[in-house]
């Protein structure tokens, strides 16, 4: 696995613990917590970042409304379980055998259940809304420069190929960015559009992933570009599957679906 | 450290130019925008404008568009700031400041030049 | 263009004493920014983001408000802290800095 040779470390995760110990002295990267070895050209998964953060100390509307099925991660932090390819295993359990399935970035989909519950498939998302709001800033963005800044962005930052961000739209001061990537589409290599995501999130809470790089500097046109609130909407190929109570009631959501549950990152 | 070093004192005559530099070190160049500040005798703190060097964007103070220019030059960490047709009242010290920004926070003009007095007289 | 009116004009401390400095804006501003200056020497940065401390300034300067209407609190003067202070917007172009306030010492 690549890393950086002179001086042995991951530059793609810092949650890694690198030493020359792989083939003829290279430099070898294994993420906390799991301690499997990651490629460090390229991102990790989110799987194995879960992993290691729990190991670690502790008008015309352009906007998109979110699909009834979308899923927003409400259940917080939690230690995954992770198969030996660093994705999420899709049955997910807590010490205290409460257990439940997850999709393929590792939300919730089904209601919990105990140990008999089944969870026969990991189902992939394959359309992730991030949904931005950015802070009042002295000059305005212009829709097209935002637009190609943020695409440059995901291909250069987090090596997600250009034709998985799908769309961006921006009604001031809200900003969406659209990610598409079904499972034929999902080539040998290609970053997954959960852990650019994921990649992402962390950066815009100035919890950079990245190895010894400074918080993200997103500027339009030199124009600084602070968030203020991230939301992340996550769409399964397969709808998730959960009880009528959770649907009609009772949920602790912030709109019409109560499965749109509000996340907060800022 | 981060430090911005300025070029030395200038006189000059009534409509004429003068050029200021400002030499950067200690951080990654491109990744701030340089700002310029003047302050005139016994006035208070003047904003002119901004450049960012990874890209060449500027902003400049409507009040002096037409009169500055700024310029960078990568290869050698340097921004300069241009101002044309001065007259007496330009007499001021002319600061550069950096402005470190990130999605999470703008944190202001820092650290800034040491300042370069530029006298207007005929 | 956003004016910034810092009052008072002069303030006149011992050591030890509390500042209070002012900062009111023409129109409501998201944030403020803080500087120090003293005789023959640049400004410094003290605050940014109406509240958050710049790297190495001491824990007794302290910022707050919202709107229009902002503050800076020296909570007990040092001698090293008598010098001139500015605010600055950054919610409009063009930037614009209060007209300073001086603290000086009684």
């Known amino acids: 696995h690549t890393a950086a040779q002179d001086n042995c470390t991951c530059p793609t995760n810092k949650m890694t613990v690198c030493s020359p110990d792989g083939p003829g002295g290279r430099c070898q990267c294994r993420a906390l917590g799991s301690g499997v070895a990651v490629d460090c050209s390229t991102l990790t998964s989110k799987c194995l970042l879960l992993k290691a953060r729990m190991s670690a100390p502790k008008n015309a509307r352009t906007l998109v409304r979110p699909n009834e099925h979308a899923l927003v991660d409400n259940d917080g932090l939690y230690d995954p379980d992770c198969d030996p390819e660093g994705r999420f295993k899709a049955r997910q359990c807590n010490q205290t055998s409460v257990c439940w399935c997850v999709n393929s970035v590792g939300v919730r989909r089904t209601d919990k259940g105990d140990l008999s519950l089944r969870c026969d498939e990991l189902v992939r998302t394959h359309h992730i809304l991030i949904d931005l709001r950015h802070r009042p800033t002295a000059g305005a963005f212009n829709h097209s420069d935002l637009d190609a800044e943020l695409r440059r962005l995901f291909r250069e930052r987090y090596r997600l190929h250009p034709k998985f961000v799908a769309a961006v739209h921006y009604e001031q001061p809200t900003i969406q960015i659209e990610l598409r990537q079904n499972t034929s589409q999902k080539a040998a290599g290609d970053v997954d559009i959960g852990d650019a995501a994921y990649y992402f999130e962390r950066d815009v809470k100035g919890e950079s992933l990245f190895q010894g790089r400074g918080g993200l500097d997103l500027r339009v046109r030199g124009e600084p570009l602070q968030v203020e609130r991230t939301l992340i909407y996550y769409l399964d190929e397969i709808p998730p599957k959960f009880s009528m109570k959770r649907l009609t009631g009772g949920g602790s959501g912030g709109g019409s679906h109560h499965h749109h549950h509000h996340h907060h990152h800022h | 450290q981060v430090q911005l070093v300025q070029s030395g004192a200038e006189v000059k005559k009534p409509g004429a130019s003068v050029k200021v530099s400002c030499k950067a070190s200690?951080?990654?160049?491109?990744?701030?925008?340089i700002n310029w500040v003047r302050q005139r005798p016994g006035q208070g703190l003047e904003w002119m404008g901004w450049?960012?060097?990874?890209?060449?964007?500027?902003k400049y103070n409507e009040k002096f568009k037409g009169r500055v220019t700024m310029t960078v030059d990568t290869s050698t960490s340097t921004v300069y700031m241009e101002l044309s047709s001065l007259r007496s009242e330009d007499t001021a010290v002319y600061y550069c400041?950096?402005?470190?920004?990130?999605?999470?926070?703008?944190?202001?003009?820092?650290?800034w030049g040491q300042g370069t007095l530029v006298t207007v007289s005929s | 263009e956003i004016v910034l009116t810092q009052s008072p004009a002069t303030l006149s401390l011992s050591p030890g004493e509390r500042a209070t400095l002012s900062c009111s804006a023409s129109?409501?501003?998201?944030?403020i920014y803080w500087y120090q200056r003293k005789p023959g020497q640049a400004p410094r940065l003290l605050i940014y983001?109406?509240?958050n401390l710049a790297s190495g300034i001491p824990a007794r300067f302290s910022g707050s408000g919202s709107g229009t209407d902002y503050t800076l609190t020296i909570s007990s003067l040092e001698p090293e802290d008598f010098a001139v202070y500015y605010c600055?917007?950054?919610?409009?172009?063009?930037?614009?800095f209060g007209q300073g306030t001086k603290v000086e010492i009684k």
């Open positions: 200690g951080y990654t160049f491109t990744s701030s925008d």
């Open positions: 450049i960012y060097p990874r890209d060449g964007s500027k």
């Open positions: 400041a950096r402005r470190f920004a990130t999605v999470v926070s703008n944190y202001g003009l820092d650290p």
């Open positions: 600055q917007q950054w919610n409009s172009y063009p930037l614009t």
């Open positions: 983001d109406t509240s």
């Open positions: 129109s409501s501003v998201n944030y």
